[in-house]
Interface confidence: low
């Protein structure tokens, strides 16, 4: 049987065919995607955007990254407020300090300590 | 379609500022790192910078830290970068150029910022 | 800042013919996380540079497949089989692995 490019399309992700020839064709791809049948997610990851550690997770034309505990944001750089998250952080009458990357205790009463239970 | 659009030429004198624009279509505008890099007449790129749009955070060239300022209005999806302080070596094309792949996948078409007295 | 070396500065092509490009980067471009960031472009005359291959060997969106790349670590080839009329400008090394980004100065291929 006769080969037509086009048909069926050998175009996969939603890429659209187009014959250039009579036994050559182009995928046109969508956003994200490569490859001569655009069969390839394009790895979007960057190496250096992801601050504080995160770690770069690829999507389809889109990249996020996965943050440590103390981090938020879509690039880590935002802080996380320990002090909201964890209301009896600090024991004792403790006063619970928002830092970047973390959260500290100040103690009275003489108790010490990181969580003032000392 | 990705299309990274930017204002057109300007003429400044020496210790001026300039302030360019970057629109940004067809992605997701938060997604994405924009960078500002620029060229010479006869050389090759230069990194300036690049901004987070959703967060604003920054980071810059040692070079042109203190004279560069980079900010987005995520409203209309437009980057800016602002320099000051122009000097004659400042006549240069500035590009915004949009993350990916660890690389700057699309590009604006440039914009020639001329310092002369 | 990372020195991106690129050979030659000129290089006189004939159309159909094949090209090779060095780009030399004073040190690794091995990433921590185990990629190499090192990336082509090519600048047609009165246009924005446009990527054509990114972390070594990757073809980006809509390149033909006469463009590859190899290399590692420092040394770093661009290869062009069967050069086109629009293949014609000049060609720019990026790395991206250590900051700043750095690119190289540039090869310009020309009609020979």
């Known amino acids: 049987s006769l080969y037509v490019p086009c048909a069926p399309s050998p175009c996969v992700n939603g890429g659209t065919c187009r014959q250039t020839g009579d036994f050559t064709f182009e995928c046109n791809c969508l956003p994200g995607f490569e490859g001569s049948t655009c069969e390839r997610n394009i790895d979007d990851c960057p190496n250096h955007r992801c601050q504080n550690g995160g770690v770069c997770v690829d999507g389809v034309n889109t990249y996020n990254c996965r943050c440590p505990p103390q981090w938020t944001g879509q690039f880590c750089t935002e802080d996380v407020d320990e002090c909201l998250l964890q209301p009896n952080a600090c024991q004792n009458g403790g006063t619970c300090a928002n830092r970047n990357g973390g959260y500290g205790c100040v103690c009275v009463n003489g108790w010490s300590g990181d969580d003032c239970s000392e | 379609e990705v299309q990274l659009v930017q204002s057109g030429a300007e003429v400044k004198k020496p210790g001026a500022s300039v302030k360019v624009s970057c629109k940004a279509s067809?992605?997701?505008?938060?997604?994405?790192?924009i960078h500002w890099i620029r060229q010479a007449p006869g050389q090759g790129p230069e990194w300036t910078g690049y901004?987070?749009?959703?967060?604003?955070?920054?980071k810059f060239n040692e070079k042109f830290k203190g004279r560069a300022t980079l900010t987005v209005d995520k409203s209309s999806t437009t980057a800016y970068m602002e320099l000051s302080r122009l000097r004659s070596d400042d006549t240069v094309v500035y590009y915004c150029?949009?993350?990916?792949?660890?690389?700057?996948?699309?590009w604006g078409q440039g914009t020639l910022v001329t310092v002369s007295s | 800042d990372v020195l991106m070396t690129q050979t030659p500065v000129s290089l006189p092509v004939s159309l159909g013919g094949q090209v090779s490009i060095s780009c030399r980067s004073s040190q690794s471009l091995v990433h921590s996380d185990g990629n190499t960031y090192l990336h082509w472009f090519l600048q047609k005359p009165g246009q924005s540079p446009q990527l054509l291959i990114y972390?070594?060997?990757n073809r980006f969106s809509g390149v033909p497949d006469r463009f590859s790349g190899s290399g590692s670590g420092t040394d770093f080839t661009l290869k062009i089989s069967r050069v086109e009329p629009e293949d014609l400008g000049v060609y720019y090394c990026?790395?991206?692995?250590?900051?700043?980004?750095?690119f190289g100065g540039g090869t310009k291929v020309e009609i020979k």
């Open positions: 972390r070594i060997s």
């Open positions: 067809g992605y997701t505008f938060s997604n994405y790192v």
């Open positions: 990026l790395q991206s692995t250590h900051f700043p980004d750095t």
């Open positions: 901004i987070i749009p959703g967060s604003g955070g920054t």
């Open positions: 150029a949009r993350d990916g792949a660890g690389s700057f996948t699309y």
